[in-house]
């Protein structure tokens, strides 16, 4: 921003009002007056070039220093060409002296020059040669010095003249200051320019009205150069929630707009599914029946719970049952949607029913779940199931009601029996099976069905109650196909797959495990 | 109205003295430079004497220096001229006037004047 | 340091005269013109590089040039006759202030 002055004086803004000293009197400097468009222009003149040794001054009114630290003197002046003058006037000089001194209190018509510092000489860019000066054309010059620091109550400036023809026009005596300035949402105050070229006056700034300093942020600070520019912001100011920066200034935000936080963005419409905000809003409430998250921002649009899974399908294979569904109709707004598996069971005698999570094996965690299907095992046989699958958002746990869809499934099979080869020789195959531990108590006997290869025709069965059998009597190096499958009080459980096991050849020897 | 109005004039005889006065109304006496110019009978103008506003300057010509003494009352809004070992030279129309600026004029108001005669 | 003027110059009325005022001071200070009718106090005519008093007809000019001013009457008028002085600040130190002479200006 660009400096302001303080004027401390103005001559020619004073009309001749000011009636500064000169000495000596009246034959040095001399007050003149020349009208210009009807203005009367006043200056101040002296033009003793033919006589030698002039040394004529002239001393301004005291003038008082308030709280300048450094000022600036502008000086408009003509200086006639010594060329002017017969044989160029040897005593003619083309410059002057400016000069200035502190006091305390006004001297009054008491002059000393023995009291006053040497500012400058002061030359003129340009002279006013003999054929201007008859044309009417005078070469004005302008010359600025400046003086600090400062420091006693007031001062006067001086000019000697040493035998020049010189004509004052204007002095104009000011110090700057930094103008009153609004950055960054930050107020800072009129400060005086300091007096050190090199410093800069840091100058704390305060942060408009709903303006804050955001958090870790820096407090606002300028600096104050000499020249009155204010230079090198530091840190700033935002518009507090909701407030939006209009200008230099924060507004509050709109009915039906709301800012929830420090920063420079402007005030955001309220989003889907909010109430009308009052003006200031910080955040806009949710209408009835929808919510926002801990997590959700303020910008995102209320939601609510989703619906249930459109679609379930529970499909019994053995003693498994793969669940499958679809997502929830209406999505709540969201997308963050989980599903979890829940599972009871019941026994059909007696129509008693429990949880069943601890007996069952899920071939995923059933909460959380982010796909639409999941199998679960390890069913027991003969008993009824029933599966709820319910969908749920980040805002289901701000609601008691849940959203959930039930499938039944009634399991008649053993889960059919994992087999293996435990060895074998020329003439025998030794096999094992397992079914799991909750199914072991229904299961009466195991049935073992085998047959040659590509014979059809004929199989041969044997029963037995444990979990493993050794099939003798068989053609060496020849495949068999082997089925277990478990027998119960009900009937016949779910068979194994057939496996192909082959006996050794002659040449192999005794009984290898496989 | 601005007007300067003097008295004092009169014969006088060589060797002495009299006191001219000028009184000044209509404007701020204090602020400006006055003079006094005389004009000898059927002569020129011939500048006299000078003092400052507040009085703490004075200058004269030649031709009267160390006999003539400036002087001036800035509460009575009045200007004197004490002339003493006057000399038949001296005779003349004695005019009091304003320096409109400065401390050299111009003048831009005169008294009415008043004439001073030296003859024994 | 002198300031010369002619002792008299004549014009017929509505005629332009001009009355010249030579003299040092003129190269370093403007010089002003009085008017002076018999039995009254100079008037002031002009001043500075050209400025006249409010009340002064602007039939009335000055001008310089080098060491000479001069004073133009322009349609010059009965009542325009009287002594005419001109009157500088004297450059030299000598004085303050110097008159010329004065020219007795007549409209025939």
């Known amino acids: 921003a660009q400096g302001k002055e303080v004027v401390l004086l103005d001559f020619a803004a004073a009309g001749g009002e000011l009636g500064w000293l000169t000495h000596p009197y009246g034959k040095g400097w001399d007050l003149m007056q020349n009208i210009m468009n009807d203005m009367p222009i006043y200056m101040y003149s002296v033009c003793n070039v033919m006589s030698g040794d002039q040394d004529n001054w002239l001393r301004t009114n005291w003038v008082y220093r308030g709280e300048a630290e450094r000022i600036f003197i502008e000086l408009k002046f003509t200086v006639r060409d010594c060329n002017s003058f017969p044989g160029g006037a040897s005593s003619c000089k083309e410059t002057f002296n400016l000069y200035y001194a502190e006091s305390d209190l006004d001297y009054g018509t008491n002059f000393q020059k023995r009291l006053f510092t040497k500012i400058d000489t002061i030359a003129p860019d340009e002279i006013t040669v003999s054929s201007d000066f008859e044309a009417r054309h005078v070469k004005l010059n302008v010359e600025e010095r400046s003086v600090g620091p400062l420091t006693r109550k007031g001062f006067y400036l001086a000019f000697q003249d040493i035998g020049a023809c010189v004509a004052l026009l204007s002095v104009r005596v000011y110090y700057k200051k930094c103008p009153e300035l609004l950055q960054g949402l930050a107020h800072f105050p009129e400060t005086i320019a300091g007096s050190d070229a090199p410093s800069l006056a840091t100058v704390a700034g305060t942060c408009v009205d709903h303006a804050v300093v955001p958090p870790g942020g820096e407090e606002p600070r300028m600096h104050c150069a000499v020249d009155g520019e204010w230079l090198v912001p530091i840190g700033q100011c935002l518009c507090q929630a909701g407030y939006e920066k209009v200008e230099d200034a924060c507004q509050a935000c709109s009915p039906g707009f709301f800012k929830f936080e420090a920063s420079e963005s402007p005030c955001l419409e309220c989003p889907e599914h909010t109430l009308p905000s009052p003006e200031g809003a910080t955040s806009c409430e949710c209408e009835e029946g929808f919510f926002r998250a801990p997590q959700d921002p303020a910008s995102m649009p209320c939601t609510r719970p989703p619906s249930a899974p459109h679609y379930l399908t529970a499909v019994g294979m053995g003693a498994k049952v793969e669940l499958r569904w679809t997502p929830p109709q209406d999505s709540g707004g969201r997308e963050d949607i989980v599903y979890s598996v829940t599972c009871e069971q019941c026994w059909p005698e007696s129509g008693e029913c429990g949880p069943c999570e601890a007996s069952v094996r899920y071939s995923e965690p059933p909460h959380g779940l982010t796909r639409t299907s999941v199998t679960v095992s390890d069913l027991e046989p003969h008993m009824n199931y029933t599966f709820t699958v319910e969908a749920r958002n980040g805002v289901s746990g701000l609601v008691t009601s849940r959203s959930f869809r039930t499938a039944s499934v009634s399991i008649n099979q053993t889960e059919p029996p994992k087999v293996r080869l435990e060895g074998r020789s020329t003439t025998s195959l030794s096999v094992s099976w397992s079914i799991p531990p909750p199914q072991q108590s229904r299961v009466w006997k195991y049935e073992v069905t085998y047959r040659k290869k590509g014979d059809s025709n004929s199989y041969n069965v044997r029963r037995t109650e444990g979990f493993s059998v050794t099939l003798d009597d068989l053609a060496p190096d020849t495949t068999y196909l082997v089925q277990v499958q478990a027998l119960t009080q009900e009937g016949q459980g779910a068979g194994s797959k057939v496996h192909e096991f082959q006996t050794l050849s002659p040449e192999g020897s005794g009984n290898l495990a496989v | 109205q601005v007007q300067l109005v003097q008295s004092g004039g009169g014969l006088v005889q060589p060797g002495g003295s009299l006191r001219l006065s000028c009184a000044a109304s209509?404007?701020?006496?204090?602020?400006?430079?006055m003079h006094w110019v005389r004009q000898a009978p059927g002569k020129g103008l011939e500048w006299v004497t000078v003092?400052?506003?507040?009085?703490?300057?004075?200058y004269y010509a030649d031709s009267v220096k160390g006999r003539f003494t400036i002087s001036r009352d800035n509460s009575k809004n009045t200007l004197y001229l004490q002339m003493n070992s006057l000399r038949a030279e001296d005779t003349a129309v004695y005019y009091c006037?304003?320096?409109?600026?400065?401390?050299?004029?111009?003048?831009?108001?005169w008294g009415q004047g008043t004439l001073v005669t030296v003859s024994s | 340091s002198e300031l010369t003027q002619p002792p008299s110059v004549s014009v017929a009325p509505g005629q332009t005269v001009t009355i010249t005022c030579q003299g040092d001071?003129?190269?370093?200070?403007?010089a002003s013109w009085y008017q002076q009718k018999p039995g009254t106090a100079p008037k002031l005519l002009i001043y500075?590089?050209?400025n006249r008093p409010s009340g002064v007809p602007d039939r009335f000019s000055g001008s310089s040039s080098g060491t000479s001013a001069s004073l133009t009457i322009t349609g010059a008028q009965a009542e325009d006759e009287a002594d005419y002085y001109c009157?500088?600040?004297?450059?030299?130190?000598?004085?303050?202030?110097?008159f010329g002479g004065g020219t007795k200006l007549t409209v025939l």
């Open positions: 006037a304003r320096a409109s600026v400065g401390a050299t004029g111009p003048f831009d108001i």
């Open positions: 209509g404007f701020t006496f204090s602020s400006y430079a």
């Open positions: 003092i400052s506003p507040p009085g703490s300057n004075k």
């Open positions: 001071s003129l190269r370093s200070y403007y």
């Open positions: 500075g590089e050209n």
């Open positions: 009157n500088s600040r004297d450059s030299s130190g000598t004085h303050l202030t110097v």
